[in-house]
């Protein structure tokens, strides 16, 4: 969210369209202060692994959970739409006991035919003692796979184990991986779509197919739009993330499903178990793999990854390290853009997109991934803008 890491001082929030700073009390107050009006359309977020719906209060200049009292599916759809999800993606809403909260946003059902923020007011009480949990899309569910495999020197993945994984082809050749986040949107790496590959017509996405030899022309989805992060730096690979919008939406099934984007408030632990997957080389300087491979890796805290003997301060806040410092397991050429995922609350979350590394599976050279947590606001913004 833009409230963190913006160019403005602690007391200001940056407008994307103009770069100007506005007072937090003018954010989400029902009046557009940014030229592009974005101060009024980024007022809702899902928080933590339980997808708790939070709304920004311009009065209190902070985020508050929404009380369940009188909430219904219509409001849930509107909140999801404001985040950038299309209405027909809407999955479900739940209720989470949040007795720890002391401050809520509540619905005024008699407010009339006005937008959702004008229907919400600040309250210190919530009679249901429950807050709204919102799933804007049924994401992060796979067919259970206990089989361990590795990208470098490993075995193949089982069908449906990584249903969000796509193979991105240029002229019938696998070039990069990607992750499905909605029926229309794929997350990949910005370095995959550097010029001249920034033209969407170069790209075809294949979903739900494990073997490269089965990815023939008719089975692919054409890419309609390629959006690279505006602050991507090709030298340092900072902000190495891109989005692809498909011409036709994917049809979800057991083998094709979206992964969940991480929510603010989700704490990642050093040494947390994650998985990487892709059709990349199974050995350094090797050929692209025929089958989809996957591997367990551990998150490595940035401080260690930035140490003199590892990546010597090349890791920025927009990057995340994973692998094993002793090597052996790693992503490799051709895995770029693919997912780094972790499971929490029985849901799979997209933590990173495969970005770079020094060689493959070398000791003290873990894989480096785009830190998706840093980019979720940007992703939602692109989805909203495309509306």
């Amino acid at each position: 969210w833009k409230f963190m890491g913006s160019k403005c001082s602690n007391s200001g929030i940056e407008c994307d369209s103009s770069g100007t700073c506005i007072n937090p009390s003018n954010w989400c107050d029902g009046v557009s202060h940014c030229p592009g009006g974005e101060d009024e359309n980024r007022c809702v977020r899902l928080y933590g692994p339980n997808f708790i719906l939070q709304v920004y209060s311009s009065q209190r200049k902070s985020w508050h959970p929404v009380c369940q009292d009188d909430w219904n599916e219509n409001y849930g759809r509107a909140a999801c739409r404001d985040m950038g999800y299309k209405n027909n993606f809407y999955s479900s809403q739940g209720i989470v006991d949040d007795s720890g909260s002391t401050s809520f946003m509540k619905l005024n059902t008699s407010a009339g035919n006005v937008d959702i923020y004008k229907k919400l007011y600040h309250s210190d009480a919530c009679s249901s003692k429950a807050v709204v949990s919102l799933r804007c899309i049924a994401c992060g569910v796979n067919l259970n796979s206990s089989r361990q495999s590795r990208i470098v020197g490993g075995e193949s993945a089982l069908p449906g184990a990584w249903p969000w994984q796509v193979s991105l082809h240029v002229q019938n050749v696998h070039v990069c991986g990607g992750s499905i986040i909605t029926p229309e949107w794929i997350v990949t790496a910005a370095h995959c779509v550097e010029k001249p590959l920034n033209n969407p017509w170069h790209w075809t996405a294949f979903a739900g197919i494990l073997r490269q030899s089965f990815m023939f022309y008719g089975a692919g989805y054409q890419v309609e739009k390629v959006i690279s992060h505006p602050n991507y730096d090709s030298k340092t690979k900072n902000n190495d993330i891109a989005l692809m919008k498909l011409q036709k939406p994917l049809t979800f099934n057991d083998l094709v499903k979206p992964v969940c984007l991480p929510n603010p408030g989700m704490m990642l632990q050093p040494e947390q178990l994650c998985w990487i997957s892709g059709w990349g080389a199974t050995e350094e300087k090797g050929k692209t793999s025929e089958v989809l491979n996957a591997a367990k890796v551990l998150l490595i805290e940035t401080q260690r990854c930035n140490s003199r003997y590892v990546y010597d301060n090349l890791i920025t806040p927009a990057m995340i390290c994973a692998g094993f410092l002793q090597g052996n397991v790693d992503s490799c050429q051709g895995d770029s853009g693919g997912p780094l995922v972790t499971s929490k609350n029985n849901i799979w979350w997209l933590i990173g997109d495969t970005s770079w590394g020094s060689g493959c599976a070398k000791a003290y050279r873990p894989g480096v991934y785009g830190n998706v947590m840093v980019f979720t606001d940007w992703i939602y913004r692109q989805m909203r803008a495309d509306g």
């Epitope: 009188d70 219904n72 599916e73 219509n74 739409r81 209405n87 027909n88 059902t109 035919n113 509306g387």
Partner: antibody
């Protein structure tokens, strides 16, 4: 005065298509969600589709993939494109305005247009 | 899908009677229950929205109550123009579903 006037109904063969229109007046059309509801002769009311002020659409499973709701705000018009029609789609079709999108109640209804699907 | 049931399916009453119609949802729908009146050959007309709010222009003899799964429409003193079919509708979640209707006719 709020008014909704449906048109486009008629007799069509099974498998055929029909496009219903609903012309709205007396309110700021673009600000309101709109629904289509149908009623077979002597039967109850059945929700058919909805379109939000932002253009987002909703359908029940019974018509999903066959019916398409759309709106043209500049013309204050709501449409229902009905394809692959079946005998079970025979009904009077009403367009209705949602009084408050959040509460979802239908505060104004048109007079209805009859669609008959028969060979 | 949320199923809506109404009882009775029909009733006979006289002018001046107090009439009560109940509507039950298969799961909790909070307060998102609306009542409509329909006369033969006419479009439905909104009477009550969000369980208990009276639509403007609707006589005050009509009232609604309830929340969760059980709701009631009451006509305190039945008038000749009230003989019609009454439908409840939930607008809590999609698909938006209607009750089967209650026909009120003259005894």
């Amino acid at each position: 005065e709020v008014q909704l006037v449906e048109s486009g109904g008629g007799l069509v063969q099974p498998g055929g298509s029909l496009r219903l229109s609903c012309e709205a007046s007396g309110f700021t059309f673009r600000s309101y969600d709109m629904h289509w509801v149908r009623q077979a002769t002597g039967k109850g009311l059945e929700w058919v589709s909805a379109i939000g002020s932002a253009g987002d659409t909703l359908y029940p499973d019974s018509v999903k993939g066959r019916f398409t709701i759309s709106r043209e705000n500049a013309k204050n018009s709501l449409y229902l494109q009905m394809d692959s029609l079946r005998a079970g789609d025979t009904a009077v079709y009403y367009c209705a305005r949602v009084g408050d999108w959040g509460s979802g109640y239908l505060d104004y209804w048109g007079q209805g247009t009859l669609v008959t699907v028969s060979s | 899908d949320i199923q809506m049931t109404q009882s009775p399916s029909s009733l006979s009453a006289s002018v001046g009677d107090r009439v009560t119609i109940t509507c039950r949802a298969s799961q909790s729908i909070s307060i998102y229950l609306n009542w409509y009146q329909q006369k033969p050959g006419r479009a439905p007309k909104l009477l009550i929205y969000v369980a208990s709010s009276l639509q403007s222009g609707v006589p005050s003899r009509f009232s609604g109550s309830g929340s969760g799964t059980d709701f009631t429409l009451t006509i305190s003193s039945l008038q000749p123009e009230d003989f019609a079919t009454y439908y409840c509708q939930q607008s809590y979640g999609t698909p938006f579903t209607f009750g089967p209707g209650t026909k009120v006719d003259i005894k």
